[in-house]
Each structure stands twice: as structure tokens, then as C-alpha cells.
């Protein structure tokens, strides 16, 4: 079986995918769908997946959803949400992705790959 991808490589690939879907993008991602904002300080991968998994039929983020699934150790399904959700705060998918991207770059620079 193929050897597992090193965490640093996987994180870099996720960052690159988020860059791909946001570069020079002014039109709303996923038809302007709104998702729950999350607390970025802990458990970011599962929390991000729990939020984005509720967006369906948006090809632009399907790869991101799959990649986040690889980072999250437990199964995530639509409608599920942990305490990491920012209470009653919804933002557009595009802003969610940008905020996530900023945070993941910070983690990468700090060497926090898991």
C-alpha cells in the first residue's frame, strides 16, 4: 500500500487548494452560501469540515471537503456541529475559506502540521 503523505505535505496541498479557489475571485463562492463561523484556535480541521459539509452541490469546494476529511480523525456528517462553532454567526463561504487559509498558513509557518 502507498506510504502515507507527510502531514506537512498534506497541509501544504490543502493551502494550495484554498488558494486555487480564492485567487482573484470576486463572484460569491457556492452561490453565496452561508456557513457557520468557527473558532480557529483548536480542532480547526474537523470544525471546518463540520461547517463546510453542509454546503452541497458546490464543485468549487468539493476537493477542499475531501482534503479536510483526511485531516479529521472522526466521521463528520451534515448537520453535525461541535462546540467550536461561533454561536449564531454565519459568514459567506468565500470569507470562511479566506479566514481558514490565513489560519492554516500561520500553522504551517509555526510547524504545526497536525
Amino acid at each position: 500500500s502507498p506510504s502515507p503523505v507527510p502531514p506537512s505535505t498534506a497541509l501544504k496541498e490543502l493551502i494550495e487548494e484554498l488558494v486555487n479557489i480564492t485567487q482573484n475571485q470576486k463572484a460569491p463562492l457556492c452561490n453565496g452560501s452561508m456557513v457557520w463561523s468557527i473558532n480557529l484556535t483548536a480542532g480547526v480541521y474537523c470544525a471546518a469540515l463540520e461547517s463546510l459539509i453542509n454546503v452541497s452541490g458546490c464543485s468549487a469546494i468539493e476537493k477542499t471537503q475531501r482534503m479536510l476529511n483526511g485531516f479529521c480523525p472522526h466521521k463528520v456528517s451534515a448537520g453535525q456541529f461541535s462546540s467550536l462553532r461561533v454561536r449564531d454567526t454565519k459568514i459567506e463561504v468565500a470569507q470562511f475559506v479566506k479566514d481558514l487559509l490565513v489560519h492554516l498558513k500561520k500553522l504551517f509557518r509555526e510547524g504545526q502540521f497536525n
Partner: antibody
Framework: EVQLVESGGGLVKPGGSLRLSCAAS????????MSWVRQAPGKGLEWVGR??????????NYAAPVKGRFTISRDDSKNTLYLQMNSLKTEDTAVYYC?????????????????WGQGTTVTVSS | SYELTQPPSVSVSPGQTARITCSGD??????AYWYQQKSGQAPVLVIY???KRPSGIPERFSGSSSGTMATLTISGAQVEDEADYYC???????????FGGGTKLTVLG
């Protein structure tokens, strides 16, 4: 002071090669996406290609007329951008500018090439 | 390959409003950027992300975008605004940059 200084231009015969360099200072070069833009004599600006920052994948993209002949690379330890030009044609004659593309940006928005070098002239002629 | 289309020239008298257009199929979803280039000089960014003005650029420069058309407006054009203006954007993938053919702005002194 934010600055970009190109070098390496000159006269070369058709089919020949040339490597341009662009030395950056005054900003965090490793964070920046960098582009090359050229301008043929009396003509408009033409996008040549760009390279992302290493953290954003370090990937390159090229305009159709130069794809397969030109290669953009970077050395973040030297704060330097490069343009390797092979199989040069007379129509590659131009002033070549390097330009920043998202200096210090932390995400994928494309802020425009807000810092430019003074340009270096490449002449391809027999 | 993707193209941005600009008028070759625009002429105004000093104090008049100059409008330079740029059309491209991807502009509804991709931002436009505008550069000013004076003779023998490197380009200078005057508008980014359709309508934002970098610091140091006079307020008379503004930008807008609607559908497949982006517009650079110079309200109360001055003689020193005489230059070539280029719109810049990317194709729909965001991966490939493109410039319009450029518009020569003449401010009739």
C-alpha cells in the same frame, strides 16, 4: 524602501538563451507572488508568467507564447526572481519587467502588481 | 486565449471626465486592475480589485465594474494624467494574467 531591480538583459541571436534576474528588497520576498511582464517596442504590456510563494505551492503559470520556452524560478534565500529564456525568437524583443503580485498577502486574493522594477531590455536579432 | 478589450484612445479637455472601458468575459467573476504608464516609465497601479485606490493615488481616479465591463474614471482630468492606461485581470481559472491592449489618454491642453 520596496524595490525590484532587474538585470541580465542584452543582445542575443534567435534560438539563443538568456537568464534575467530580479533582486528584491524592502519586503518579505518569500511571501510574495512574483510576475514577469514584457513590453515590445511601441507596444502594450504583455503578461509573461508568474510564480506563487512557496507556501502557496510555488507553482508557475505562463502565457501561451512563452510556455515551454521560458521558466520562472525563485531563490527566497537570495530574495531573487529569475526568468530563464530559451529558444528565443525575434518577437521576444522587449523590455522585461518583474513585478510583485500580492506583496505580503496571506491569502489567495490577487492584489495587483503594485511594485515594479525599472525593466531590462532584451533584443533578439541576428 | 483570454482577451481584454480597451479602446485605443480617449481624448478629453482639462477638467473633463475621462472614462476608459475594458471588456472581458471573465470580469463578472474576476477583479480588474488598472495601471498608468507614462512614456519611458514603469507602470503604476492606480486601481485594484475593480474600485479600490492604492495610497498615494489621487481621488480623481476611480474604478467600477458591471457585468463584463470594467471602467476607469478620471474625474477632472489633468494634463499630468496624459498616459497609457492598461486594464489587467485573469482568466476564469485565476491562473493566467492578461492585459488589455492599452488606451492612450490625451488631455488636450
Amino acid at each position: 524602501e520596496v524595490q525590484l531591480v532587474e538585470s541580465g538583459g542584452g543582445l542575443v541571436k534567435p534560438g539563443g538563451s538568456l537568464r534575467l534576474s530580479c533582486a528584491a528588497s524592502g519586503f518579505t520576498f518569500s511571501n510574495a507572488w512574483m510576475s514577469w511582464v514584457r513590453q515590445a517596442p511601441g507596444k502594450g504590456l504583455e503578461w509573461v508568467g508568474r510564480i506563487r510563494s512557496e507556501i502557496d505551492g510555488g507553482t508557475t503559470n505562463y502565457a501561451a507564447p512563452v510556455k515551454g520556452r521560458f521558466t520562472i524560478s525563485r531563490d527566497d534565500s537570495k530574495n531573487t526572481l529569475y526568468l530563464q529564456m530559451n529558444s528565443l525568437k525575434t518577437e521576444d524583443t522587449a523590455v522585461y519587467y518583474c513585478a510583485t503580485d500580492q506583496v505580503g498577502a496571506y491569502y489567495g486574493d490577487y492584489y495587483g502588481m503594485d511594485v515594479w522594477g525599472q525593466g531590462t531590455t532584451v533584443t533578439v536579432s541576428s | 486565449s483570454y482577451e481584454l478589450t480597451q479602446p485605443p484612445s480617449v481624448s478629453v479637455s482639462p477638467g473633463q471626465t475621462a472614462r476608459i472601458t475594458c471588456s472581458g468575459d471573465a470580469l463578472p467573476e474576476k477583479y480588474a486592475y488598472w495601471y498608468q504608464q507614462k512614456s519611458g516609465q514603469a507602470p503604476v497601479l492606480v486601481i485594484y480589485e475593480d474600485s479600490k485606490r492604492p495610497s498615494g493615488i489621487p481621488e480623481r481616479f476611480s474604478g467600477s465594474s458591471s457585468g463584463t465591463m470594467a471602467t476607469l474614471t478620471i474625474s477632472g482630468a489633468q494634463v499630468e494624467d496624459e498616459a497609457d492606461y492598461y486594464c489587467h485581470s485573469t482568466d476564469s481559472s485565476g491562473n493566467h494574467g492578461v492585459f488589455g491592449g492599452g488606451t492612450k489618454l490625451t488631455v488636450l491642453g
